[in-house]
């Protein structure tokens, strides 16, 4: 389906509003340090050019690829060398190398100030004064901080952001209406960003075979009534969509996502009975709804898997004829029967099955060799079941904050070389698995927990890749996508680690502690806890608990004092001395 002008094609398909939004997101994800005004100017120039191509597809430069057009535009930025350093070298390259170069310079942890939320009245005034600019600023600020955010989904978040302000700025109590909505959007947005980052890592680091396997498993759980051929078609289309978005081809990605939503809604009968309410919604909402749709009910009469995958005399013949398809069918059949398993577990089972067939189908008596293959699955299934059970018990016993602290200690002991801010961020997020998953019924716990942990551990892998400090982290992150979580779970105390020298400055606190939000206080305390473990990796739980209890008491005491700063100055060194003694 070739077009004389790709830019005209996408402009017509997407419409001006979505076209402009997606180009702004694309530019903001590539040039994360550029000021908002600069990006708006570039987007307006591209949009005007697209309109000339819509009017006449034969006009000059209209036949150029989107990468060429966008790359040329990005390379006009005057301060590229000063702001981005070696990224400016990308501009000396030709397509497709230039785009690859831009992609490689995306920064998962850009040095940008945290977004500060102004007063509600200030935000409402800004919204009413210039709604379009207000919403563009939202797209820009999110996109530059999350350079792999799923672009068509970000347009959906922006639409919800707009709706929240339109409703709440009219309300009697603006803050009561708006703030919970903004909190929800922030939390959902962070989760969405992290989930998409795992998809991109899967595609970029492990190839589209890995992504397709993930998609077969997940879609087979969601759509257990669909035929394998239908699931395969959806997987192929979904892989194309995510490959495009992860590759910076945001216009193509959004267009193809809309086509996929259209196809699913036109073929509901052969996919799932749960799609109906999604399909009545407008485009952005519809695509979001389809992505989040609950699992359909399993067909009642599914036969045993053993017949086709263990007992049949054709197992090796069928495997040899089309290995990936046969494994895909196995994964489909297993996943549709097991919505209670995590996708990662299902992929481990498929991997184990593949390894068995590779070994046994070349043996003298294949059937005798693979006859017990399903028995070999048992330990693979029990491992995450036990992990979820133990950690949910610990979460219920400790509560979220102390559960996070237990994970902080656990992970700092495993990989003490990792930076303290990264350990705090990752362990806090690992700890959120409790509140997210442990309240669910048994059948939903493992898919919730393990697939969430995979997303969080991917964040650790992505940050660690930027500044590698631990061979153990590199090994767990790169050897196998499906075994990342078990790999991290299996890590023990790093005996080779040389404890960090004690630095009193790290444990010096001031009166500003008292004005921090509860969350910020927790982060301060958890930062201190990581530093303690780095200093004394072999400290016992009891020792660390004692120090943290003393710390909480010391902060509480000084925050109640009349002269807070004097209290911190006087009590701080006492706390440090007592802590050192307790950990000696």
């Amino acid at each position: 389906d070739t077009h004389k002008s790709e830019v005209a094609h996408r402009f017509k398909d997407l419409g001006e509003e979505h076209f402009k939004g997606l180009v702004l997101v694309a530019f903001s994800q590539y040039l994360q340090q550029c000021p908002f005004e600069e990006h708006v100017k570039l987007v307006n120039e591209v949009t005007e050019f697209a309109k000339t191509c819509v009017a006449d597809e034969s006009a000059e430069n209209c036949d150029k690829s989107l990468h060429t057009l966008f790359g040329d535009k990005l390379c006009t930025v005057a301060t590229l060398r000063e702001t981005y350093g070696e990224m400016a070298d990308c501009c000396a390259k030709q397509e497709p190398e230039r785009n690859e170069c831009f992609l490689q310079h995306k920064d998962d942890n850009p040095n940008l100030p945290p977004l500060v939320r102004p007063e509600v009245d200030v935000m409402c005034t800004a919204f009413h004064d210039n709604e379009a600019t207000f919403l563009k600023k939202y797209l820009y600020e999110v996109a530059r901080r999350h350079p792999y955010f799923y672009a068509p989904e970000l347009l959906f978040f922006a639409a919800r952001y707009k709706a929240a302000f339109a409703e709440c700025c009219q309300a009697a109590d603006k803050a009561a209406c708006l703030l919970p909505k903004l909190d929800e959007l922030r939390d959902e947005g962070k989760a969405s960003s992290a989930k998409q980052r795992l998809k991109c890592a899967s595609l970029q680091k492990f190839g589209d075979r890995a992504f397709k396997a993930w998609a077969v498993a997940r879609l087979s759980q969601k759509f257990p009534k669909a035929e394998f051929a239908e699931v395969s078609k959806l997987v192929t289309d979904l892989t194309k969509v995510h490959t495009e978005c992860c590759h910076g081809d945001l216009l193509e990605c959004a267009d193809d996502r809309a086509d996929l939503a259209k196809y699913m809604c036109e073929n509901q009968d052969s996919i799932s009975s749960k799609l109906k309410e999604c399909c009545d919604k407008p485009l952005l909402e519809k695509s979001h709804c389809l992505a989040e749709v609950e699992n359909d009910e399993m067909p009642a009469d599914l036969p045993s898997l053993a017949a086709d995958y263990v007992e049949s005399k054709d197992v090796c013949k069928n495997y040899a004829e089309a290995k990936d398809v046969f494994l895909g069918m196995f994964l489909y059949e297993y996943a549709r029967r097991h919505p209670d398993y995590s996708v990662m577990l299902l992929l481990r089972l498929a991997k184990a099955y593949e390894a068995t067939l590779e070994k046994c189908c070349a043996a003298a008596d294949p059937h005798e060799c693979y006859a017990k293959v399903f028995d070999e699955f048992q330990p693979l299934v029990e491992e995450p079941q036990n992990l979820v059970k133990q950690n949910c018990e610990l979460f219920e016993q400790l509560g979220e904050y102390k559960f996070q602290n237990a994970l902080l200690v656990r992970y700092t002991k495993k990989v003490p070389q990792v930076s303290t801010p990264t350990l705090v961020e990752v362990s806090r997020n690992l700890g959120k698995v409790g509140a997210k998953c442990c309240k669910l019924p048994e059948a939903k716990r493992m898919p919730c927990a393990e697939d969430y942990l995979s997303v969080v551990l991917n964040r650790l892998c992505v940050l660690h890749e930027k500044t590698p400090v631990s061979e153990k982290v590199t090994k767990c992150c790169t050897e196998s996508l499906v075994n990342r979580r078990p790999c991290f779970s299996a890590l023990e105390l790093d005996e080779a680690y040389v404890p960090k020298a004690f630095n009193a400055e790290t444990f010096t606190f001031h009166a500003d502690m008292c004005t921090l939000s509860e969350k910020e206080k927790q982060v301060k305390k958890q930062t201190a806890l990581v530093e303690l473990v780095k200093h004394k990796p072999k400290a016992t739980k009891e020792q660390l608990k004692g120090v943290m209890d003393n710390f909480a008491a010391f902060v509480e005491k000084c925050c109640k004092a009349d002269d807070k700063e004097a209290c911190f100055a006087e009590e701080g060194p006492k706390f440090v001395a007592a802590s050192q003694a307790a950990l000696a």
Epitope: A229, K317, A320, E321, A322, K323, V325, F326, M329
Partner: nanobody, 123 residues
């Protein structure tokens, strides 16, 4: 465009030998499993042999086991079937095939086919 071109068929006496070849193009031969299937006059399709992409896994129908040998040369994009101790009941058109798409492996409508090469075994 996928193309499979068989050659090497002919007329042979019982107990004789033939070597069939199948030249493949238009798809990733080296990552595709390959199959020989035959159709005797007035009969349905009969699977003969399968070889995996890397030739580690090889399967034969009981009727040809010990007499036929399947092999492949991925550098030349060619599939072979060495047929020894031929019998009258081996008379058939021999096709090479590879899985294309669809819902089931082994249901041969979902495979790409060659045009076939005739093997006749008669005294």
């Amino acid at each position: 465009e996928v193309q499979l071109v068989e050659s090497g068929g002919g007329e042979v006496q019982p107990g004789g030998s033939l070597r069939l070849s199948c030249a493949a193009s238009g798809f990733a031969f080296s990552t595709s499993g390959m199959v020989w299937v035959r159709q005797a006059p007035g009969k349905g399709l009969e699977w003969v042999s399968t070889i995996s992409d890397d030739a580690r896994i090889i399967r034969y129908a009981e009727s040809v086991k010990g007499r036929f040998t399947i092999s492949r040369d991925n550098a030349k994009n060619t599939l072979y079937l060495q047929m020894n101790s031929l019998r009258a009941e081996d008379t058939a058109v021999y096709y090479c095939a590879t899985y294309r798409a669809g819902s089931r492996i082994g249901s041969y409508e979902d495979y790409y086919w060659g045009q076939g090469t005739l093997v006749t075994v008669k005294p």
